[in-house]
Interface confidence: low
């Protein structure tokens, strides 16, 4: 028997520095977690103690904090090189700055293979990107070899900006021939490393013949055997065992997100490359694990540029940006309109001639808007200003919901109207009319939504049975502010870009902004 230790991360999302327990900015260092300096300590400790160790990342290192906004992926290459990662799979967010934003800072600088078997380049890009990422890589580990085959969510064109010269194929269809190729090369231990979410990870384990282990990402899935060490609730045991169609037991793992845990899986193979046993658990990277001093010093050096950036002007406003709770929790506010417009703009993806865009709607809880921005400071807007408006370090995500769920959400928005509660929704691509004289649960008298399958966008009545795409804060997707119906009834959920980054990019693009209150939210006569 031969034993392999797989260390794995996924969906780190730019958390290079340690964070608080909820993965937001670290406030009390004695209770902070994660970060690359702490990760390095644990990885080195395991490498010294065990003979056959692989350190793998399942994608979405990009996007999530000011680190990515400023360094645009150079920080990912630098610190992953420093930690000596063995391989990485491409995630959807690796394409957030386009293909160039992946090639230059990461693909050309990484000293480890970057993988995806189901992304095929065409046209002029094919020769430019050739060899910079691979479908698979055979890695020597001790006296043996291990094949790593990569995959990426085929939804990436809807979630990021890969351009028109990359084709995202069905994961299973694309993986099988690559695994078969590895088998012909006499590689009998194969890990599928990728970024398509836990459901697809399980399908890959079930369907792709020859895959021994699946290391996944994208769905931020937390698996754990025994009593979990922090706030995350396990979606299943670690590893999660799938019985493949040809009768093998295939371990599937994921390690939550944000670098809070280091996945730790021990696999025992027989001489024919069959998995005999698998066990392990994610390791919580809490303050009991010291930060490595050399990596920490490097982090501090890179940090200086971030502090300078946060006070630089991103753009100007020539109007007061009303983000006060007196406005945003009671009526349409122009800060809400600005944020929603930025959210839609960030999701412009022309992937189908029949649609002007794949999504037109935004909802945003008024309670998530924490500050106004005064235009009387020469109109200047900085990252620091936006951090006061959106201080929680959330993301703006893409969900699919039935019309009936949206109707419930808008009823919830005003079910206890007048108490300055955070659930009052700000909107984009939606016209809503409330009648507050009616009883709670029956106050939405008109709900029109902007069409997507149209060349000239116009507002049509919401259809209860139709499935709509909506951009909203991850807080709402997770049922926050009492929006349990969204969490319970959503049909799909893909995590998006950092909230501040979305708004700052939009302001930088527009240069001068002047959002108005324009009748997106109305109250019918006599009730308000």
């Amino acid at each position: 028997a031969w034993e392999l230790t797989i260390l794995h991360t996924n969906d780190v999302h730019s958390r290079l520095e340690q964070t608080s327990e909820d993965s937001s900015k670290c406030v009390n260092a004695s209770r902070c977690m994660g970060g690359v300096a702490r990760l390095f300590t644990k990885v080195q400790q395991i490498r010294r103690a065990e003979p056959n160790v692989l350190l793998l990342d399942a994608g979405d290192q990009y996007q999530g904090t000011i680190w990515f906004t400023v360094y645009k992926g150079a920080e990912v290459a630098h610190f992953m090189n420093a930690l000596r990662y063995d391989a990485m799979a491409l995630g959807n967010h690796e394409f957030d700055n386009g293909v160039e934003g992946l090639i230059e800072p990461l693909l050309k600088e990484a000293k480890f293979p970057i993988l995806s078997a189901n992304i095929k380049a065409k046209g002029p890009l094919a020769s430019q990107i050739s060899g910079l990422y691979l479908p698979y890589k055979v890695l020597p580990v001790g006296d043996e070899v291990v094949g790593i085959v990569g995959y990426t969510s085929k939804e990436t064109p809807f979630l990021s900006n890969p351009g028109t010269n990359l084709v995202f194929e069905d994961e299973i269809t694309a993986l099988q021939p690559e695994v078969d190729k590895l088998k012909t090369l006499n590689v009998n231990k194969i890990i599928a490393l990728g970024h398509s979410g836990f459901e697809m990870d399980k399908l890959i384990a079930q369907k792709v013949r020859g895959v021994d282990v699946v290391v996944g990402g994208h769905s931020n899935t937390f698996l754990y055997t025994g009593n979990p060490p922090s706030k995350e609730v396990p979606a299943g045991k670690y590893p999660f065992i799938v019985t493949s169609d040809d009768g093998r037991k295939v371990p599937v793992v994921q390690a939550y997100a944000f670098g809070k845990y280091l996945g730790y899986l021990k696999i025992e193979f027989d001489e024919r490359g069959n998995v005999i046993s698998s066990h392990g658990n994610p390791i919580l990277l809490n303050s009991s694990i010291p930060e490595d001093p050399s990596i920490k010093a490097d982090i501090n050096k890179w940090r200086i540029k971030l502090d300078n950036y946060s006070t630089q002007e991103l753009g100007k406003t020539i109007v007061y940006l009303d983000g006060s709770s007196q406005s945003c929790r009671f009526r349409e506010c122009n800060m809400g309109n600005l944020i929603c417009d930025a959210m839609i703009n960030n999701n412009l993806r022309h992937t189908d001639e029949m649609f002007w865009n794949h999504v037109s709607m935004c909802i945003l809880n008024g309670g998530g808007i924490r500050s106004p921005i005064d235009e009387r400071n020469n109109g200047t807007i900085t990252w620091e200003n936006l951090a006061a408006v959106l201080p929680f370090g959330g993301t703006f995500d893409l969900v699919q919901l039935k019309g009936s769920t949206l109707k419930k959400a808008f009823e919830h928005s005003v079910h206890r109207y007048g108490q300055s509660t955070g659930e009052f929704l700000q909107v984009g691509g939606i016209h809503v009319v409330y009648d507050l004289s009616r009883k709670p649960g029956d106050r939405v008298v008109k709900l029109d939504v902007l069409c997507t399958k149209c060349r000239v966008p116009s507002y049509d009545p919401l259809k209860m049975d139709e499935v709509y795409k909506v951009i909203l804060p991850n807080f709402l997707a997770n049922g926050g502010d009492g929006f349990q119906m969204i969490k319970d009834e959503l049909l799909r959920h893909d995590s998006g870009d950092q909230d501040i980054n979305v708004v700052s990019t939009y302001i930088s693009k527009m240069k001068v902004i002047y959002p108005a209150v324009e009748g997106r939210i109305k109250f019918s006569t006599g009730s308000h």
């Epitope: 085929k154 939804e155 069905d170 269809t173 021939p177 013949r209 169609d245 040809d246 009768g247 049909l491």
Partner: antibody
Amino acid sequence: DVQLQESGPGLVKPSQSLSLTCSVTGYSITSRYYWNWIRQFPGNKLEWMGYMTYDGTNNYNPSLTNRISITRDTSKNQFFLKLNSVTAEDTATYFCARGGWDPFDYWGQGTTLTVSS
Amino acid sequence: DIQMTQSPAALSASVGETVTITCRASDNIYSYLAWYQQKQGKCPQLLVKNAKTLAEGVPSRFSGSGSGTQFSLRINSLQPDDFGTYYCQHYYGTPLTFGAGTKLELK
């Protein structure tokens, strides 16, 4: 119980397009599985035409790639077959079925199509 | 494409007899093989998946065997309801292909 039901025109003229609908009850086509079109020629030969996966990806038989399109309406839990430029060779019984990366465990009863002027 | 070759094309047998139908794949399909039974004017019905696992509700007189490229379907003690046409089909990759069928008739 899962049920599939095909519907379509029965007779189509050569060079025209064929459109068929498969209505699924008892299971959401967005939940899992692949949703297929299969046809059976008069001599009983079965041919897999293509599928649409639960999340909307298509895979077609290369012999039909330039003529076939499979789409869906998730709100009605239906998926559709469109076959362009039909000839007498497309005369067959058309079945919809659930499966693809699994065997076809549920089939519709089939709809007979004749291509004739 | 993977070709599926079924034999015999037709077979006559009596109630109570045992028959075997074979199917050969042009390439290794591991255990990704299904068997179907079809009656005149009806849709095919799944009998066996993964080469040897009986589908739900299929009587135990049916059994599948084989892996790689050679497969067989055996029916012990034929019953009147067993007459019809039998097809094998691989689902190793696309395009999915069927055998030409074996027509089992009452002698």
